[in-house]
């Protein structure tokens, strides 16, 4: 807290600008009028304050504002966000996408910070949705920021604004975030091509169901290893052999080199050693011939 | 954390030159903006003159034309403080200071270098 002091002579400040850099802080306190600072925002940014002197400016707006700054104050910002709380960020109605683009570039390069999800929580909460130009933004600066919400949260995402992701957002989502992603993005690309379709949905194939799978063995879409091997275990284990085959195309071959991984690994225990051997890749663990597969879970359901 | 660390400082008769350096190691990546400080004995500590991340510079008005400031954003960051046409009144403890970008944003200081201004 900065005390009260009067201003010396000659020192009120007309407008910001850099010779309030040598201000001291009871000076900038004293000499600095609250609603000149804040019609002048935009040049505090260009402005090379000490995070002290930007500390005065804060307590300056605050007093103005205390229920929130407005905002056009918001926008402007700049450096002085650094300076803000969670708390002072819970009391702000952020609902242009340029304020926020202009808060994040002040965080750029950095780990996202409790600041940073607090704005982005209003901010989508203030729109209602996870719209498409909001998505573009938000993974452009932060590429994982997808696989950060919850499947509750990622419910909220119009299948429309699907168009805006980019595989490097999905690199660390689970399993359950890839359940909720793929019928969305099935839904986007649903008017595309084979080959168009495939390149787009790709990367949210780990929530797809084996029927999809299924569906684009029949395709000649020469899935590639690591996509093949981020795939749901439980869709993948009732392919069969000459479905993998279809599927993967000339990439067939790599299921040697992940035979002991999931989900090949389960895949094979399910398979014939017979139909393995058609492969010729010399893959072992299938199930010997002569021999009888009883599906106990069947069974139960009958009886 | 960023570690600042002064020379240069010395002994010179007034209207001499010296040239203060500071070095910069650890996170310099880090770094924002850049100034040197002076503290007379019984006096506040003044901005000299500051360096912002874009190279542009600013002067205190005692010190605008004899002073210049500059920095390098090589491997290892360097301020300098290029004094010339020294006065006695400039004799002070000269301090090194950087920001860095991020939150909360952290100020690092160095220990200072000793200019002494003889008439």
């Known amino acids: 807290e900065v005390e009260k002091t009067a201003c010396p002579s000659g020192k009120k400040a007309r407008e910001i600008d850099e010779s309030l850099i040598f201000y001291k802080k009871w000076e900038l306190e004293a000499c600095v009028d609250a609603a000149l600072l804040a019609t002048q925002m935009d040049r505090v940014n260009a402005i090379p304050f000490t995070y002290e002197q930007l500390d005065v400016l804060k307590h300056k707006l605050d007093e103005l504002y205390p229920q929130g700054y407005p905002e056009s104050v918001i926008q402007h910002l700049g450096y002085l966000f650094l300076k803000m709380s969670p708390e002072d960020i819970r009391k702000w109605n952020v609902t242009s996408l340029e304020t926020l683009k202009a808060l994040l570039e002040v965080n750029k390069g950095h780990e996202m910070s409790p600041q940073v999800a607090t704005l982005i929580d209003r901010f989508v909460k203030g729109r209602g949705q996870l719209d498409k130009d909001t998505l573009d933004t938000l993974t452009a600066f932060y590429p994982g920021y997808l696989c950060s919400l919850s499947p509750e949260e990622l419910s909220s995402v119009p299948p429309s604004s699907i168009w805006a992701v980019r595989p490097q957002d999905l690199d660390t989502c689970d399993p359950r975030q890839l359940d909720v992603l793929y019928p969305k993005a099935r839904l986007a690309f649903q008017n595309m091509n084979g080959s168009e379709y495939f390149v787009k949905i790709q990367s949210f194939l780990g929530g797809a169901p084996t029927e999809d799978l299924k569906a684009l063995s029949q395709q000649n879409v020469s899935m590639d290893l690591a996509t093949f091997m981020k795939l749901r275990t439980d869709a993948v284990l009732p392919l069969t052999v000459a479905e993998v085959q279809k599927l993967l195309g000339p990439h067939v071959e790599g299921l040697k080199a992940e035979e002991r991984h999931r989900p090949v690994r389960d895949w094979i225990l399910r398979q014939r050693q017979d139909d393995l051997d058609t492969l010729g890749l010399g893959l072992q663990g299938g199930i010997p011939n002569g021999y009888l597969v009883l599906d106990l879970s069947m069974q139960e359901a009958l009886s | 954390q960023v570690q600042l660390v002064e020379s240069g400082g010395g002994l010179v008769q007034a209207g001499g030159s010296l040239r203060l350096s500071c070095a910069a190691s650890?996170?310099?990546?880090?770094?924002?903006?850049m100034r040197w400080y002076r503290q007379a004995p019984g006096k506040q500590r003044e901005l000299v003159a500051t360096v912002s991340n874009d190279g542009s510079a600013y002067y205190l008005g005692s010190v605008k034309g004899r002073f210049t400031i500059s920095r390098t954003n090589a491997k290892n960051t360097l301020l300098y403080l290029q004094m010339n046409s020294l006065k006695p009144e400039d004799s002070a403890l000269y301090i090194c200071?950087?920001?860095?970008?991020?939150?909360?944003?952290?100020?690092?200081w160095g220990q200072g270098t000793q200019v002494t201004v003889s008439s």
């Open positions: 650890g996170s310099i990546s880090s770094i924002r903006h």
């Open positions: 200071n950087a920001d860095t970008w991020g939150w909360p944003g952290a100020d690092y």
